[in-house]
Interface confidence: low
């Protein structure tokens, strides 16, 4: 069998809402993946599991099942959404994300994704992780790749 390539493209959109009383931020982050089947037979994308970390803490998880099949030598672009919650010991971020007298509210999130594919009863897992900028101060739609964060630094804690 030839390889199945998974490429994490980036954040497509991030929609934000707040709970003032709980000092909590809710971010629905939609990500884009390209999955390429380099084989001469179809493969099934059985599931995608994803999680998002902020400051080494998991703030959101998602799992998509029975997603699609990819034909021979074909590629499919798949969007998946991870609902995240920044709260409790990270509620100090509420101050940052809602302060109006600063312009940029970018936070650095680590996106982790695992794609499980099957063909002829065989199962294969491919994982990727990437640091991304996400604006927690407003709803944002990104050009693909626009939110990439190359210098892998942790935010101040």
């Amino acid at each position: 069998p030839r390889s199945i390539d998974v490429k994490y493209i980036g954040v497509k959109s991030a929609y934000v809402s707040y709970d003032v009383q709980k000092r909590t931020i809710y971010l629905n982050i939609t990500n884009t993946l390209n999955i390429t089947n380099n084989n001469y037979y179809s493969v099934e994308v059985e599931n995608i599991t994803a999680q998002v970390q902020f400051a080494k803490t998991v703030i959101g998880k998602a799992r998509l099942n029975n997603i699609t099949h990819i034909g021979p030598l074909d590629m499919k672009q798949i969007d998946y959404t991870v609902p995240t919650v920044i709260a409790e010991e990270m509620s100090y971020m509420y101050d940052f994300c809602t302060l109006i007298s600063i312009k940029v509210h970018n936070i650095v999130l680590m996106m982790q994704v695992t794609v499980t594919t099957t063909y002829f009863g065989h199962s294969e897992q491919i994982s990727q992780e990437r640091y991304q900028y996400v604006d927690c101060g407003r709803n944002t739609t990104y050009q693909l790749g626009q939110s990439e964060y190359l210098n892998v630094l942790q935010p101040q804690q």
């Epitope: 509420y94 940052f96 302060l99 109006i100 007298s101 600063i102 940029v104 509210h105 970018n106 101040q156």
Partner: antibody, heavy 123, light 112 residues
Framework: QVQLQQPGAELVKPGASVKLSCKAS????????MHWVKQRPGHGLEWIGN????????HYNQNFRGKATLTVDKFSTTAYMHLSSLTSEDSAVYYC????????????????WGQGTSVTVSS | DIVMTQAAPSVPVTPGESVSISCRSS???????????LFWFLQRPGRSPQLLIY???NLASGVPDRFSGSGSGTAFTLRISRVEAEDVGVYYC?????????FGSGTKLEIK
């Protein structure tokens, strides 16, 4: 250590213009906004505006629109304020001050100030 | 624009005593995030302003704990306990909730 260096004094003629400088050192210049503040003799402090050195985004006090223009030179880590059509009302000490913006710790804004440049408008 | 009012142009104080300096804003500086965006600065004679208090009640780095800030959304107090000679100068409040940022007119601390 953090330093904001400003020239001590400028003497200019009425109707002329002047470009004040504020040389920053000891920190990452593009991570902090630069504010400019005016203080006339015997008067209080007046906020002129600020500039984000990372992309030159500016905010101005409406009272200074057309009077002050804020710019930066990232390479020399220097902020500038150009004052035009000077009158005696513009005779004052002008301070620059930094404040953190777009980061996780924006609390201690305007924590470092320059020594101020005294501008005298006189013929 | 938000107007910052410091009603007392000056306050006399005896060294070792405590003093309070007040400031009012024309609009609440309490943000929905629970923070109050008010600074206090001290300008000593012939010097640049120095940050004392940020977000109404947080002591800036290197500032003695004799200084403290308190208040509500529109009424604020800077308290100095055990006043020392080096505390003389003009105290300014400033809001940074909205542009343009605005200062109070200042209150001069004078030693009796």
């Amino acid at each position: 250590q953090v330093q904001l260096q400003q020239p001590g004094a400028e003497l200019v003629k009425p109707g002329a213009s002047v470009k004040l400088s504020c040389k920053a050192s000891g920190y990452t210049f593009t991570s902090y906004w630069m504010h400019w503040v005016k203080q006339r003799p015997g008067h209080g402090l007046e906020w002129i505006g600020n500039i984000d050195p990372s992309d030159s985004d500016t905010h101005y006090n409406q009272n200074f629109r057309g009077k002050a223009t804020l710019t930066v030179d990232k390479f020399s880590t220097t902020a500038y304020m150009h004052l035009s059509s000077l009158t005696s009302e513009d005779s004052a000490v002008y301070y620059c001050a930094r404040s953190r913006g777009g980061t996780y710790d924006y609390g201690e804004a305007m924590d470092y100030w320059g020594q101020g440049t005294s501008v005298t408008v006189s013929s | 624009d938000i107007v910052m009012t410091q009603a007392a142009p000056s306050v006399p104080v005896t060294p070792g005593e405590s003093v309070s300096i007040s400031c009012r804003s024309s609009k609440s500086l309490l943000h929905t995030n629970g923070n109050t965006y008010l600074f206090w600065f001290l300008q000593r004679p012939g010097r640049s302003p120095q940050l004392l208090i940020y977000r109404m009640s947080n002591l800036a780095s290197g500032v003695p704990d004799r200084f403290s800030g308190s208040g509500s959304g529109t009424a604020f107090t800077l308290r100095i306990s055990r006043v020392e000679a080096e505390d003389v100068g003009v105290y300014y409040c400033m809001q940074h909730l909205e542009y343009p940022f605005t200062f109070g007119s200042g209150t001069k601390l004078e030693i009796k």
